[in-house]
């Protein structure tokens, strides 16, 4: 496929990545699917600098990111290693609160109103951020 060299319309370029910030709210799985359909993924935060960039754009509203532990350990949706990577949890989070009886605790991570991270029930209707990398081969077939 051809390489993406500039961001799509209504996406914001930052450090060789493109970001799209939702205004509406969706459950985590619906948000994840939305990003995939855009040939992107829920945002993966790899540095304090990227954290600050995203925080500036989302404001004080709970916002899903591409981090979950629905299959056990915490995982980033793009395969970035969680254990060795950047983290910005609120104090005493993630707490994986099991009281809701959904069977898996609080399995999805979101930015809170102060930007720090919390884990919550994945069905909550929060905003979300999609990210795609520039110079990444797109899924479109090359022009003949």
């Amino acid at each position: 496929g051809s390489e993406r060299t500039c961001c799509p319309v209504n996406w914001v370029e930052h450090e060789r990545s493109c970001y799209w910030f939702s205004r509406s709210g969706k459950a985590w799985a619906d948000a994840d699917n939305y990003c995939r359909l855009e040939d992107a993924h829920l945002v993966v935060v790899t540095s304090w600098e990227e954290q600050k960039f995203v925080q500036r754009h989302i404001g004080p509203v709970n916002t899903w990111m591409g981090l979950h532990d629905q299959n056990g350990p915490w995982k980033w949706v793009d395969g970035t290693d969680y254990e060795t990577g950047f983290k910005n949890w609120r104090p005493e989070q993630p707490d994986d609160w099991y009281g809701h009886g959904l069977g898996g605790g609080e399995d999805c991570a979101h930015f809170t109103d102060d930007g720090r991270w919390n884990d919550d029930v994945c069905q909550r209707p929060y905003r979300w951020v999609c990210e795609t990398e520039l110079d990444k081969a797109s899924q479109e077939p090359p022009l003949l």
């Epitope: 205004r23 809701h100 069977g103």
Partner: antibody
């Protein structure tokens, strides 16, 4: 003190339209999500719609989807519910209620309600 | 949609009694459960949110508990002003849904 005052209710024929208003005071209106909830005579509470603090997100009950529109004017501290194609089953007391946060944190403050009667 | 089932639908109690109302949800709702009190001809009043957190100004005789799909509202010592209808509500996701209500009457 925090106050919500609904207006615009009345008697209307089936198929006609009505617009409800909710005037807010005593808090920073533009920081809070707002909801409409209704109660048919002698029945329980039914959630109708929500609009987030900045108007960016709106959700509706299936029973009113496509007929009712929730909106807000933050400069006027006012919430609205435009009700079209009214049916007899829309007869109810309509309450506006403040969300505890931007729109997904539950209800805390309620207005006194305005009565809508749909009858021919 | 998430279904909310309250029980009992009505109960008779005396002043000073301890009253318990239950709310069962059709699926887990996290901690996103609220309780409301409504008196005839009046607007609902918020009592509790996030299962057990008291709204400002609500007396501590009201308490909430539960997890998973089963939740409870308890009034520790019923007073004359507590005779009303009580509703539970989930706000985990849209559409928000209410229980059918429990009417607390004087015995």
């Amino acid at each position: 003190q925090v106050q919500l005052v609904e207006s615009g209710g009345g008697v209307v024929q089936p198929g006609r339209s009505l617009r409800l208003s909710c005037a807010a005071s005593g808090f920073t209106f533009s920081s809070y999500g707002m909801h409409w909830v209704r109660q048919a005579p002698g029945k329980g509470l039914e959630w109708v719609a929500v609009i987030w603090y900045d108007g960016s997100n709106k959700n509706y009950a299936d029973s009113v989807k496509g007929r009712f529109t929730i909106s807000r004017d933050n400069s006027k501290n006012t919430l609205y519910l435009q009700m079209n194609s009214l049916r007899a089953e829309d007869t109810a007391v309509y309450y506006c209620a403040r969300d505890q946060g931007v729109g997904y944190d539950g209800l805390d403050v309620w207005g006194q309600g305005t009565t809508v009667t749909v009858s021919s | 949609d998430i279904q909310m089932t309250q029980s009992p639908s009505s109960l008779s109690a005396s002043v000073g009694d301890r009253v318990t109302i239950t709310c069962r949800t059709s699926q887990g709702i996290g901690k996103y459960l609220a309780w409301f009190q409504q008196k005839p001809g009046k607007a609902p009043k918020s009592l509790l949110y996030k299962v057990s957190s008291l709204q400002s100004g609500v007396p501590s005789k009201f308490s909430g508990s539960g997890s998973g799909t089963d939740f409870t509202l308890t009034i520790s010592s019923l007073q004359p002003e507590d005779f009303a209808t009580y509703y539970c509500q989930q706000y985990m996701t849209y559409p928000l849904t209410f229980g059918g209500g429990t009417k607390v009457e004087i015995k």
